[in-house]
């Protein structure tokens, strides 16, 4: 019994004065607590308690379930205890089969003994199976058997508490250990799509997938820079032990322009947190934006090829695309394809392949595209560069020499005089008159230039050269002069 110095409050004294007492089932338990300030007896087994305000605790016919710790407490809060074992050969264990273990922590298998004199108090696997090799435990007859440092691998392990009684092994009822995993990594989060583009009134729905070792992982959808709680729906699955998946679906049934923004799926566990975002853009109506990939004014040489290429953004999806020239629609020679195979792609490419262009094929080539909301178009002005062609070279009745040339860009006409029979004409002759004939006509195709000089200026035999040229090339025509006496006998034009 405890002893304290006089004057100080002392703990109560218990009779019988021993720490442990063994009684047989059916016998009487009689415990006396002596203390002037007696308050109560408390009985505790399997962490359950009963109280008694009498200073003498009497149980006339003891049962195995009367096994436990009896504590007497006085008004000073001082106490003394005795542990009573009620030996019952038919009930060697008191049990509470709820058995949960947290990974890496210890857990108690609650199977206290009713007889402390049995031997080999330990754990055994069910159906004769051995325990995991690394499972360590510490037996305590008054509390049960403590499993040290629970492993994930012990989940759903079936156990018995076991003792040897009179040379025979006796097993308790079954215990099934349920292990709660420790979080050793942040949750894994992913989102169904990284960005969404919708029209007003359409439904926005996005799913976040959260993966972790248990359902204790916390997750939520949040709107960036907003505290508003979003409405989510959940689905979840256990893909075997410690492989948990949750799908959190956020839905806005009728999206508005002001719903546009960044939405974050956030998940955390005791190890840490992870998040993933998706961007929503809500437009009041659909759109098409066209971006030419080449200059919309195109110069191409006669006989060469050119590709007219546009990229365009279309939402919703484009429904009709066409290329048009001179009010005629191309049925072939063009292709249209999405810029990427991504499900959220809104960018497309259209290419018109013009091959071996002729001078007559310049003009406006138009790409038209439409979806259910809008139409859009872009025009390319194609100019075909052609070497000048001399259309006419004549001596007019008024004595003028006239040269008419066509080409693109607009040809320049120069005149030269070559004395005698030489064809290398160097002395330039200034024209009397130069006119661009079709400047008020259509803006595409060849430009026609007319130039005239006065032949009366020439007094000697020789050749006059009319030279038409532009960036593409040059072409010449010649007039031969022969004088007989004072008369110009003949003028022979030739190229």
């Amino acid at each position: 019994q405890p002893s304290v110095s006089p004057g100080e409050p002392s703990p109560p004294s218990i009779h019988p004065g021993k720490s442990d007492l063994i009684v047989r089932v059916g016998d009487e338990i009689r415990l006396l607590c002596t203390d002037p300030g007696f308050v109560k007896w408390t009985f505790e087994i399997l962490d359950e308690t009963n109280e008694n305000k009498q200073n003498e605790w009497i149980t006339e016919k003891a049962e195995a379930t009367n096994t436990g710790k009896y504590t007497c407490t006085n008004k000073h809060g001082l106490s003394n205890s005795i542990y009573v074992f009620v030996r019952d050969p038919a009930k060697l264990f008191l049990v509470d089969r709820s058995l949960y273990g947290k990974e890496d922590n210890d857990t108690l298998v609650r199977c206290p003994l009713t007889d402390p004199e049995v031997t080999n108090y330990s754990l055994k696997g069910c159906q004769g199976k051995p325990l995991p090799k690394d499972l360590r435990f510490i037996p305590d007859p008054k509390a049960g058997i403590m499993i040290k440092s629970v492993k994930r691998a012990y989940h759903r392990l079936c156990l018995h508490c076991s003792v040897d009684q009179e040379g025979k092994s006796v097993l308790s009822e079954k215990f099934i250990l349920k292990v709660r995993p420790a979080f050793k990594a942040v949750p894994v989060v992913s989102v169904s799509k990284a960005s969404y583009l919708l029209r007003e009134g359409e439904e926005f729905t996005v799913t976040c997938t959260i993966k972790d070792v248990s359902s204790s992982v916390y997750s939520t959808w949040k709107r960036e820079n907003s505290q508003t709680k979003l409405q989510e729906k959940y689905n979840s699955w256990h893909h075997g032990d410690f492989n948990y998946e949750r799908q959190a679906t956020l839905t806005i049934s009728s999206a508005r322009v002001n719903d546009s923004g960044v939405f974050m799926c956030y998940a955390n566990n005791t190890f840490g947190s992870a998040n993933v975002t998706t961007t929503l853009e809500v437009v009041d109506k659909g759109f098409i934006n066209i971006f030419p990939m080449i200059n919309t004014t195109v110069f191409v040489n006669d006989g060469e090829n050119v590709d007219l290429i546009v990229e365009y953004e279309a939402f919703p999806k484009p429904e009709h695309q066409q290329w048009i020239y001179m009010n005629r629609t191309f049925t072939d020679k063009w292709e249209d394809y999405p810029k990427s195979e991504n499900e959220s792609n809104i960018r497309y490419v259209s290419e018109l392949h013009l091959t071996r262009l002729k001078g007559t094929e310049g003009g406006t080539y138009t790409f038209l595209v439409s979806n259910s909301d809008v139409n859009a178009a872009i025009a390319f002005n194609v100019y075909v560069n052609t070497k000048p062609e001399i259309l006419t070279y004549d001596r007019l009745v008024n004595g003028m020499l006239q040269c008419v040339a066509a080409g693109f860009p607009e040809p320049t006409i120069d005149w030269y005089f070559c004395p005698g029979t030489e064809q290398r004409c160097s002395a330039s002759v200034l024209p009397v008159d130069v006119q661009t004939l079709n400047s008020s006509g259509p803006p595409f195709g060849k430009l026609v230039v007319q130039s005239s000089i006065d032949s009366s200026a020439f007094k000697h035999n020789g050749t006059v050269e009319c030279k038409a040229y532009n960036d593409v090339g040059k072409t010449s025509a010649y007039f031969n002069f022969a004088f007989k006496g004072n008369n110009k006998e003949q003028i022979h034009p030739h190229t």
Epitope: V95, R97, Y100, N105, R156, I176, S215
Partner: antibody, heavy 117, light 111 residues
Amino acid sequence: QVQLVQSGAEVKKPGASVKVSCKASGYTFTSYNMHWVRQAPGQGLEWMGVIYSGNGDTSYAQKFQGRVTITADKSTSTAYMELSSLRSEDTAVYYCARERDTRFGNWGQGTLVTVSS
Amino acid sequence: DIVMTQSPDSLAVSLGERATINCRASESVDIYGQSFMHWYQQKPGQPPKLLIYLASNLESGVPDRFSGSGSGTDFTLTISSLQAEDVAVYYCQQNNEDPYTFGGGTKVEIK
């Protein structure tokens, strides 16, 4: 003699939070798991979540994830269940229940929470 | 999640007659032959009361006219001779796997 005594009835507005308490006696509070179960008027029982003995880990039913928080105060042997962002369909009787020997052997008397604007 | 389906929804039985309630789990609630299945009785205005635990064990203080049987996914609660005080709603519950789930309940009345 194990007893679970719950706090009194509450009336809350939609969007508010409620915190129901469950004071335990007659056993070592930290040695047993405490569960919370609710029952809407005329409906069945619905498990909400649990706070495990020892280290206070929690686990919640998917339906309440993010809205429910179960805590425990060891010093007063009291468990708490807080439910946020209340809506009319959260009107129910909320019970705490102690898990003993694998089953819910002890129940609180229930707390009626009414959510009404 | 394990879904618990009770049948019938309601049951009217004469006093002294047998009442049988079934409960089916969407997957097995057994581990090593132990069925984590329990039965509760609830009377109006009261919390549920445990009747049968681990499929077939009678809770202390519960009359022995109540019995439970079954394993795996199919379980039965039987009241061998219905008494007036047995009028209540009866629920099955599994705690093999979190989240723990209850059946929808069976209302027992006197015919």
